[in-house]
């Protein structure tokens, strides 16, 4: 089975690498534009230059192309705590990231939010905080992990998952409550 190709891919595959087929004349292969530029006019004939123009400020192309317009530069999302790591240039999009001691949580493929790395108070660091993953904490005895923080077992209700981890403490509390004063 031949994999289905889009019209653009079909047209490009007829020409050697680095060239594309002229949209009005499929016997002509035009040279693609370099990154940082876009297609202003197709080449007039075989062996003749494609008219490529540099991207304007606020736009870019990151690879060789025959795009009629450059792509708009991304903006870092302040509301998500993002900061600009490197600004947009004609051949590279803006790079956004997080501040020191923060990690990225991806809500979707193209949306991330910056959160502070957990400090593992009342526990120990099992795995250090990384660019895309929070610190992994191991809690001390008498504490359980809730929303990546070590919380005292005194806050563990019977209905919660923590009962397994806090079982001895819960038994002790129950024992204390049950024992009457003599």
């Amino acid at each position: 089975l031949v994999p289905h190709l889009g019209d653009r891919e079909k047209r490009d595959s007829v020409c050697p690498q680095g060239k594309y087929i002229h949209p009005q004349n499929n016997s002509i292969c035009c040279t693609k534009c370099h990154k940082g530029t876009y297609l202003y006019n197709d080449c007039p004939g075989p062996g003749q230059d494609t008219d490529c123009r540099e991207c304007e400020s606020g736009s870019f192309t990151a690879s060789e192309n025959h795009l009629r317009h450059c792509l708009s530069c991304s903006k870092c999302r302040k509301e998500m705590g993002q900061v600009e790591i490197s600004s947009c240039t004609v051949d590279r999009d803006t790079v956004c990231g997080c501040r020191k001691n923060q990690y990225r949580h991806y809500w979707s493929e193209n949306l991330f939010q910056c959160f502070n790395c957990s400090l593992c108070l009342n526990g120990t660091v099992h795995l250090s905080c990384q660019e895309k993953q929070n610190t992994v904490c191991t809690c001390h005895a008498g504490f359980f992990l809730r929303e990546n923080e070590c919380v005292s077992c005194s806050n563990c209700k019977k209905s919660l998952e923590c009962t397994k981890l806090c079982l001895p403490q819960i038994e002790n509390v129950k024992g204390t409550e049950d024992s009457g004063t003599t």
Partner: nanobody
Framework: EVQLLESGGGLIQPGGSLRLSCAAS????????MVWVRQAPGKGLEWVSH????????YYADSVKGRFTISRDNSKNTLYLQMNSLRAEDTAVYYC????????????RGQGTLVTVSS
């Protein structure tokens, strides 16, 4: 106490429109970035859209871009989601929420409103 109450869901035919509302109370609404998320039957939560405090910066998931519009009225403490050209795959419970601050979970989220797109 933070309260978020969604309304406006219902049964709608493909191609139709709905406007969801979320009435907020118990916090300073104008200080919070607000989010719409949805949960389709048997699926996880999907981030649909968010809007910053002043309504200037918005974000849309690729699946709803060009069809949904998020807005807010800070004087009425209300968040909106205008949904046009609805598709069967938009069927879900829609929740409004405050943008999480401490970690990737929703401390404050409404009870949700069900949107069913079916002919």
């Amino acid at each position: 106490e933070v309260q978020l109450l969604e309304s406006g869901g219902g049964l709608i035919q493909p191609g139709g429109s709905l406007r969801l509302s979320c009435a907020a109370s118990g916090f300073t609404f104008a200080h919070e970035t607000m989010v719409w998320v949805r949960q389709a039957p048997g699926k996880g939560l999907e981030w649909v859209s968010h809007i910053d405090r002043v309504g200037q910066d918005t974000y849309y998931a690729d699946s709803v871009k060009g069809r949904f519009t998020i807005s807010r009225d800070n004087s009425k403490n209300t968040l909106y989601l205008q949904m046009n050209s609805l598709r069967a795959e938009d069927t879900a419970v829609y929740y409004c929420a405050q943008l999480p601050k401490r970690g990737p979970w929703f401390d404050y989220r409404g009870q949700g409103t069900l949107v069913t797109v079916s002919s």
